[in-house]
Structure formats: structure tokens, C-alpha cells
Amino acid sequence: QRHSPQEAPHVQYERLGSDVTLPCGTANWDAAVTWRVNGTDLAPDLLNGSQLVLHGLELGHSGLYACFHRDSWHLRHQVLLHVGLPPREPVLSCRSNTYPKGFYCSWHLPTPTYIPNTFNVTVLHGSKIMVCEKDPALKNRCHIRYMHLFSTIKYKVSISVSNALGHNATAITFDEFTIVKPDPPENVVARPVPSNPRRLEVTWQTPSTWPDPESFPLKFFLRYRPLILDQWQHVELSDGTAHTITDAYAGKEYIIQVAAKDNEIGTWSDWSVAAHATPWTEEPRHLTTEAQAAETTTSTTSSLAPPPTTKICDPGELGS
């Protein structure tokens, strides 16, 4: 087989589900040609003259299509076909986890397009255009520095997305304070308190991304439960990075998480990584088998009764 030196294949984008006709370059309609995709011959019944006709395009139709002159196997034309979809309205959100330094915006498409997309973000503070610096690691995120703190002027962030098959856009408008949401507290550790079978000592650290905890203090929200129960108990703490749980069940493993929020503005962070701990238990005594079984039954039964002071709520429901 002889192949002619060709320019790069013609790149063509077509919509999923559509029909497409691929011409064999500028070959005449009645030229005798053969088509291949990714090196595999295609059935002659897909041809209309020298053109290749594909119905109901699927993702699997993407590939390198080549037509050859049937007698000489001379490569006549190549098409790199990409099957995809136009973008739907992008999902855009902005958040300040480094208040008062700035905020970031991130975006994604609700459904894949299967082909390359180009995003363009513009940020306005009133009528002033602000720079959104691309995140070095995350391609769907950019960062904006706050120029004026406690500004009453709204921010408007717009994003447009386009690909070879279409275009879409969305925008959000917000006040500076509404998007403040710290990162979760870090290094959450829970430890048993010696000789205290109902206590667990929990410590954590302010998120390292929060730049100025002195000027912009955080409050915290702690939730905990024994692994065998589904209901959480909650404690809200106005300051400090430690708390002692005093109503734990003896001998039961607990899961503990902490969330953070600026004292005055914004919303609660997501929950921290879970810490696990079991309250202190005495060294086991040597018991008879019957007594051991009775004790196990008693302890299991009592562990299912929730403490009388249980408070069930979620940080997301709390006001500032």
C-alpha cells in the first residue's frame, strides 16, 4: 500500500446522535474510494458515492477516518472525527477560605461534553474588572484578591464555556461576606482521659489556610457519636481549639468531627477528617464465663440508650 504524504488530518467535531457525511477530500462523487477508520475497513454500504455517511453518531464513532483510492490504495484524505456535545450551563461557585485575603471561584459542567472546552471567567466588583489568577494546580479554579474589605459593593462573576459544538454561560452575584467559608479544622485528635470512662479529650487546630485568626477569630462546632449509633451529638464552641466530651459511653469507639466558621460572617466549613477514640476502660478482671456473658449483654443494652442531653442539628442550619 502506498500512502501519500499528507498534511495533518482534518479535525472535525460532530454532535452525539447526529448524522454526518464525510467527503473524501475533493475527490469526485463517483471516484472509486475505500474508507477506513483507525486502520479497519468500513463497509461499502456506508458510502454515498465517495462520501462516508454515518448515522446516529456515538462516542465510539470518534477516530481517524481515511479514504483511499481503491485501485492504488493512495491515501486521499484523512479526518480526525471527535463526537461530543455542546456545553450545558456551567456550575459556578465562589468561596473565601482565606478571608480577608481573597476568594476563589471554581466551575464545572453538569454533564461531560467529551471534547475540549474553553472557559473564560470575568470578575466585576461594581464596574471594576478584577483579575482572576489561574490556580497552578486546578484548571477549573481561579483566585481573586480582595481590594476593599467590608465593601458593600457586590461582586459579579461570569463564566462562559465554549467548544467546537456550542457555547453557554452563567453568572453569579454576591456580597463579600456571604461566601466566607473556612476550610475544616486540621489535626483533629481525640484521646481517652485516664480513669474517666465517660470522657474524651478532643483537640484540633485552626485551618492553616485561615490567614489571621487573631483579627478574624473562628468558632467551632463539634459532633460525635459512638460508631454503633447513627445520631450525632453536637457542641458549639465560641473559642478555643479543645473540648472534653463528658457523656461518652464507656468502652465504645467514638467518631468525632469538627467544623469552623468565622465568628460573625459566612457559613460553616465542611466537617474535618474524622478522629476515632474509645474512652478509658479499666483493665479487665478475671471473670467466669457466665459472668462475662452477663456483663457483655448488659453493656450492649445500655449502649443503645441515647444520652438525655442529645442535641441534634447541623452546622449548615445554624445562623451566624
Epitope: R2, S4, P5, Q6, P23, G25, T26, A27, N28, W29, D30, A31, A32, G49, Q51, H69, D71, S72, H74, R76
Partner: antibody, heavy 120, light 108 residues
Framework: QVQLVESGGDVVQPGRSLRLSCAAS????????MHWVRQPPGKGLEWVTI????????YYADSVKGRFTISRDNSKNTVFLQMNSLRTEDTGFYYC?????????????WGQGTLVTVSS | DIQMTQSPSSLSASVGDRVTITCRAS??????LNWYQQKPGKAPKLLIY???SLQSGVPSRFSGSGSGTDFTLTISSLQPEDFATYYC??????????FGQGTRLEIK
């Protein structure tokens, strides 16, 4: 019998526009890729442009890219060459030609040519 | 783009002579070469396609040969009507289609 008849050649000033036509008969026009080939006075042949049988594919020589546009009307068996921003070096005979369906492709049918003169 | 170079650019010969015109491609074009004859004031006319195939209606004194980069058009016995300009043209990698600069054949 097969005929290709070009028209529209004229004397024009540099920077002006001109539209050439080529009327075809005697063959199934809508099956054929159509070319324009030009020849400056006393010089050789230069390929200018091609349009595929259905008009979906168009290619141009670098010397005319962005200035010339080829089009066709299969219902009227006619191919056109719109020439804008004409230069003195565009002067010459312009031939339309139908390409062969066999490979290698060659110019199977030719018109008699129409003269374009670009001069101030 | 593939460049086509013809030689000689002109030549003088007599009726009955055997004449050879050569055409060289800047890269291999297999056998995808065509030869045309053009007389003054007329459109070109195809003589040979695919390097060596004689177009229908063309006298058998015309022949073509070659493959790769070097090609020849031979007229075995020149006739008065053969005095014209001859062009080679490649169809290997197109577009663009490229012609040789032409060889003018004159009566000696």
C-alpha cells in the same frame, strides 16, 4: 459534448474586484470537483483553487488565499471565482477545469479561458 | 508543497526527431504524474496520466515513463502539430496541485 465556458474577464484597477463564471454542460457537473487554473501572459500554468463536487471542501493557492473565493451552483451547472483586492500579478488567462474521477486526478475537461487584466 | 522542475525550459527540434522532456519532483510522487500539451491561445490538453498511461485519442508517438522523482515525456517522431509547450503536473499530495514551469518545443 463536454463544454466549459468561462466569462467575466475584464480590465480592472488594482484593489478592485471581479467575478468569473464557468458554465458547464455535457457531463454530470454535480459529480465533479472544479478547479480554476491561471496563466500569466507568456508564462506557465498556476493552480488557483478547487471546490469539491458538493461545495463542502475548498482549497486555495497561498498566493490568493483570503482574497479569492470559489463557489458553485449545481442547479445551474456553474462555478464562480470571486476575486477581491486584485493585484497586478493576478493578470492572466483564467481557465476552469473539471477533475477526473480516476486516480491520479488530472484536469479532464478545460474551458477556453477568460482574460483578467489588472492595471492602473 | 511539492515542487516540479522541468528541463529543458525550451528546445528546438525538427520534424521526425525523437524528443525527450524531463520532469523532476522535489520528493517522491510515486507514479502520480500527468503531462499536458498547450498550444498558443488554447487551453491545455491531457496527453499522459499516471506517468505512463496514454489518454484516449492521443497519438501513440507520445509516451511517458518514470516513477518516484524522475519522469520523462518522449515524442518518438515529431510531427508539425507537436510544436507546443508541455507541462508536467503532480497529483500525489494535493492540494496544492503543482505544475512544472513548462518546456517550449520549437521548430529548428
Amino acid at each position: 459534448q463536454v463544454q466549459l465556458v468561462e466569462s467575466g474577464g475584464d480590465v480592472v484597477q488594482p484593489g478592485r474586484s471581479l467575478r468569473l463564471s464557468c458554465a458547464a454542460s455535457g457531463f454530470t457537473f454535480s459529480y465533479y470537483g472544479m478547479h480554476w487554473v491561471r496563466q500569466p501572459p507568456g508564462k506557465g500554468l498556476e493552480w488557483v483553487t478547487i471546490i469539491s463536487f458538493d461545495g463542502s471542501q475548498k482549497y486555495y493557492a497561498d498566493s490568493v488565499k483570503g482574497r479569492f473565493t470559489i463557489s458553485r451552483d449545481n442547479s445551474k451547472n456553474t462555478v464562480f471565482l470571486q476575486m477581491n483586492s486584485l493585484r497586478t500579478e493576478d493578470t492572466g488567462f483564467y481557465y476552469c477545469a473539471a477533475q477526473s474521477s480516476t486516480w491520479p486526478e488530472y484536469f479532464q475537461y478545460w474551458g477556453q479561458g477568460t482574460l483578467v487584466t489588472v492595471s492602473s | 508543497d511539492i515542487q516540479m522542475t522541468q528541463s529543458p525550459s525550451s528546445l528546438s527540434a525538427s520534424v521526425g526527431d525523437r524528443v525527450t522532456i524531463t520532469c523532476r519532483a522535489s520528493q517522491s510522487i510515486s507514479s502520480y504524474l500527468n503531462w499536458y500539451q498547450q498550444k498558443p491561445g488554447k487551453a491545455p490538453k491531457l496527453l499522459i496520466y499516471a506517468a505512463s498511461s496514454l489518454q484516449s485519442g492521443v497519438p501513440s508517438r507520445f509516451s511517458g515513463s518514470g516513477s518516484g522523482t524522475d519522469f520523462t515525456l518522449t515524442i518518438s517522431s515529431l510531427q508539425p502539430e507537436d510544436f507546443a509547450t508541455y507541462y508536467c503536473q503532480q497529483s500525489y499530495s494535493t492540494p496544492p496541485i503543482t505544475f512544472g514551469q513548462g518546456t517550449r518545443l520549437e521548430i529548428k
